[in-house]
């Protein structure tokens, strides 16, 4: 199994994979496989409703880059807490001979995976024990650029009449075949997205391939600038009982996804108002509608929020309410 | 003026079938999200069901998931309940309204009552 | 679900009398941005309901000003400052913080 695998993002497309060679080889090693697939986004999210009072925004974080080529940062968890920097204490005796024994005995599991649990791959001729799992495609080194990775379709809201359970196909997962080093650059990958990246090294090349359990590490890409602004006008409809109906566009492609809108009017001389706008909210207004406003000069602001955090404020948008009482009945609705 | 008429009650057996309707007038139906409300003979509100302005995005009350189904046509400017697997439970006035997010409903149909009855 | 608690049951008035009907949440209807989303609907007998107050304590447009909200976190009130015969019905208690938005089980109205 290849040790210490470390995955980074250094740019919002690319996953820097490093690891060491495996400790105790059965044979030589000819190569690595590496996979990537890019996961859902936790259902949760799409769920809950984030401007509720109390209830925490989710911390999403990148996988930094780093530090130093020998430290083995394992990419935390957002919700853990991160440990003080402290030096390893020496080890005891005991701990040594642990170690060797753990190191014996990761030998002769590895030994019984291959001669056991894993059937070397043939090739599909027809003839001989074939491979149960479906081929895969190989992409060369060359093709790194413009990388499609086989998005898993999420239900945009999992509680509604049907949800879309993500699946991703083997088969359709982008691999990379590496040889003579220990690390990959993964290109073409989506913006503040979460992969999971599967890692094998293996000792003997086509036809029969033999390669190891698979080492996991998981990563996310760095965000990407004014992925959650708000592109397009912010537009506005007047209706009776001075109801302003605002609308805008949902960011294309956001960091994550979006979980709420901010929403910040004023009245011409009077303080700031905000309103909250969740993902639920939206969907069946198409925006959002303000209510019992007083005649005036209204100017409105509106920037969303994604895992990553906020977006930029659109420009101020402008409108009059009338003192709806003195406004003719037959005021479009 | 805002006008909401529900039509399509009736008596029916437990298991069958019956879909509502609910015809909007007086607004601009395809910028609203719409509801149906029922109330049981004697009881209290409760929510059923919600679709979003374009129809795209439905929620359900628990109580109905998997049985009912919310739709709307906005080129008809109409709404729709189309009710399967009814129960006894199911039996109740129900009301079309029109929504507006954390204010509830500003306008409710008359209602049409639906018995389910063997 | 959000549970709404409305009490009394029922209110038997005297005509030109005050009125005073309670609705209590099982958790605080302040939304994040500040709002606090507490209605209350009006359903005449043989009628469909009918919004009288919204974020507490706005009126609708037409709904008299005897009508009035006031509360805040998880206690409500409604009043009629002078009760008329126009009055009676059923009366409830809706939060829209919370999804799914629920209802109180009502208060009924009469005159004595």
């Known amino acids: 199994v290849p040790l210490d695998p470390i995955s980074v993002s250094n740019s919002s497309s690319q996953i820097i994979l490093k690891w060491k060679p495996p400790s105790d080889p059965n044979g030589n090693i000819t190569h690595y496989l590496v996979f990537w697939e890019r996961q859902a986004e936790d259902s949760e999210l799409f769920e809950l409703d984030y401007c509720l009072k109390g209830l925490k925004l989710p911390s999403r974080t990148w996988s930094p880059p780093f530090e130093s080529e020998d430290s083995q940062k394992h990419n935390q968890s957002e919700y853990e807490d991160s440990a003080g920097e402290c030096c390893s204490c020496p080890k005891t005796d005991s701990q040594i001979l642990k170690e060797l024994e753990e190191s014996s005995f990761r030998k002769t599991f590895e030994d019984y995976l291959h001669n056991v649990v894993f059937v070397p791959r043939k090739t599909s001729s027809g003839t001989g024990a074939e491979d149960p799992r479906p081929s895969r495609k190989r992409r060369s080194l060359g093709d790194v650029g413009n990388v499609t990775v086989a998005v898993p379709t999420v239900a945009a809201f999992p509680n509604t009449s049907s949800t879309s359970v993500p699946t991703s196909p083997e088969e359709h997962r982008p691999f990379e075949k590496v040889v003579n080093k220990e690390s990959l650059v993964i290109s073409g990958l989506r913006h503040f997205t979460g992969y999971r990246i599967e890692l094998q090294a293996c000792n003997q090349d086509t036809p029969e391939e033999r390669c190891s359990v698979a080492a996991y590490v998981s990563a996310r890409t760095m965000p990407e600038a004014k992925a959650d602004d708000i592109v397009g006008p912010v537009t506005h409809e007047i209706f009776e009982n001075n109801v302003v109906h605002l609308m805008w566009q949902e960011p294309k492609e956001p960091n994550g996804l979006i979980v709420l809108y901010e929403v910040s009017y004023r009245r011409y001389g009077d303080e700031e108002l905000h309103l909250c706008v969740s993902r639920k909210h939206f969907a069946l207004e198409r925006g959002c509608r303000l209510r019992g406003l007083s005649p005036g000069n209204y100017s409105v602001r509106i920037r969303a929020t994604s895992l990553a955090g906020n977006g930029s404020w659109t420009e101020p948008t402008y409108f009059y309410v009338t003192d709806y009482l003195d406004v003719p009945s037959n005021i479009a609705k | 003026e805002v006008q909401l008429v529900e039509t399509g009650g009736g008596v029916v057996q437990p298991g069958r079938s019956l879909r509502l309707s609910c015809a909007a007038s007086?607004?601009?139906?395809?910028?609203?999200?719409m509801h149906w409300v029922r109330q049981a003979p004697g009881k209290g509100l409760e929510w059923v069901a919600v679709?979003?302005?374009?129809?795209?995005?439905?929620y359900y009350a628990d109580s109905v998931k998997g049985r009912f189904t919310i739709s709307r046509d906005n080129s008809k400017n109409t709404l729709y309940l189309q009710m399967n697997s009814l129960r006894a439970e199911d039996t109740a006035v129900y009301y079309c309204?029109?929504?507006?997010w954390g204010f509830g409903f500003d306008y409710w149909g008359q209602g049409t009552t639906v018995t389910v009855s063997s | 679900d959000v549970v709404m608690t409305q009490s009394p049951l029922s209110l038997p008035v005297t005509l030109g009398q005050p009125a005073s009907i309670s609705c209590r949440s099982s958790?605080?209807?302040?939304?994040?941005?500040?709002?606090?989303?507490l209605n209350w609907f009006q359903q005449r007998p043989g009628q469909s309901p009918r919004r009288l107050i919204y974020?507490?304590?706005k009126r609708d447009s037409g709904v008299p000003d005897r009508f009035s909200g006031s509360g805040s976190g998880t206690d409500f009130t409604l009043k009629i400052s002078r009760v008329e015969a126009e009055d009676v019905g059923v009366y409830y208690c809706?939060?829209?913080?919370?999804?799914?938005?629920?209802f109180g089980g009502g208060t009924k109205l009469e005159i004595k």
């Open positions: 974020k507490v304590s």
């Open positions: 809706m939060q829209g913080t919370y999804w799914p938005m629920t």
């Open positions: 958790q605080s209807l302040v939304y994040g941005d500040g709002n606090t989303y």
């Open positions: 309204a029109r929504h507006e």
């Open positions: 007086g607004f601009t139906f395809s910028s609203y999200a």
């Open positions: 679709i979003s302005y374009s129809g795209s995005n439905k």
